[in-house]
């Protein structure tokens, strides 16, 4: 029966080469903006604009910063503790079920419907039937005439942190 081995007993045989700015972990974890060294003895800072970490962690690496796609605007840059915040350009939106791309907002509602919600970076215009007030989901039929409207102004950021 082998004795219980503590982390001190399991001292590494080889040290990694020095990298970024270092500090000591607290209870085996490094603060946001850092990752841990292989031997668990140092916290190494993430590289500004390249990678980040948002929580206390014992990961060997920081997470790569998101790059905003074409069709997106950068609301805030990537820092060592927060990922880039990207948002769809005006007149486009990102749906929950297809978050990989920004889609063009419809320019108007089908005949017999009225617009009750503007185009935002996270939702298309919202249309309801004039009489019943029920929402319309789906594409505008090509032959139907539409009531045109200009895209709405973005109200708040849509973060793709991850």
């Amino acid at each position: 029966e082998s004795a219980l081995i503590t982390q001190q007993d399991l001292a590494p045989q080889q040290r990694a080469a020095p990298q970024q700015k270092r500090s000591s972990p607290s209870e085996g974890l490094c603060p946001p903006g850092h990752h841990i060294s292989e031997d668990g003895r140092d916290c190494i800072s993430c590289k500004y604009g390249q990678d980040y970490s948002t929580h206390w962690n014992d990961l060997l690496f920081c997470l790569r910063c998101t790059r905003c796609d074409s069709g997106e605007v950068e609301l805030s840059p990537c820092t060592t503790t927060r990922n880039t915040v990207c948002q769809c350009e005006e007149g486009t939106f990102r749906e929950e079920d297809s978050p990989e791309m920004c889609r063009k907002c419809r320019t108007g509602c089908p005949r017999g419907m009225v617009k009750v919600g503007d185009c935002t970076p996270w939702s298309d215009i919202e249309c309801v039937h004039k009489e019943s007030g029920t929402k319309h989901s789906g594409e505008v039929p090509a032959v139907e005439e539409t009531v045109t409207s200009s895209p709405g102004t973005p109200a708040s950021p849509c973060s793709l942190s991850g």
């Epitope: 081995i5 982390q7 399991l10 590494p12 045989q13 080889q14 040290r15 990694a16 080469a17 085996g28 990752h35 841990i36 060294s37 292989e38 031997d39 668990g40 003895r41 014992d58 990961l59 060997l60 690496f61």
Partner: nanobody, 123 residues
Framework: EVQLLESGGGEVQPGGSLRLSCAAS????????MGWFRQAPGKEREFVSA????????YYAESVKGRFTISRDNAKNTVYLQMSSLRAEDTAVYYC????????????????WGQGTLVTVKP
Amino acid sequence: EVQLLESGGGEVQPGGSLRLSCAASGLTFPNYGMGWFRQAPGKEREFVSAIYWSGGTVYYAESVKGRFTISRDNAKNTVYLQMSSLRAEDTAVYYCAVTIRGAATQTWKYDYWGQGTLVTVKP
């Protein structure tokens, strides 16, 4: 998808040697550790050794220090465990595992596991 394939297990006499291999595929992390654990019948899985990919930091359990040697082949994404002076108490199923955490000598710090290879030491 991360896959780990162990090989090299078998039956050996006390004092003999074996070399275990663990080939990894699907690993895309900037750095990671590959460790060996073992589990004897009726006992808990225990840490044996680990090696890290970038800096080559190495860990051994006290019970195997001086007898087992861990090494890696970066080009083949393979880790080896050279086991010498084997004893009856080394009999176990040996598992290869991957971690993305530092100083990982505990089972819970490992996210990916192989199926295991049986090592039997008996006269």
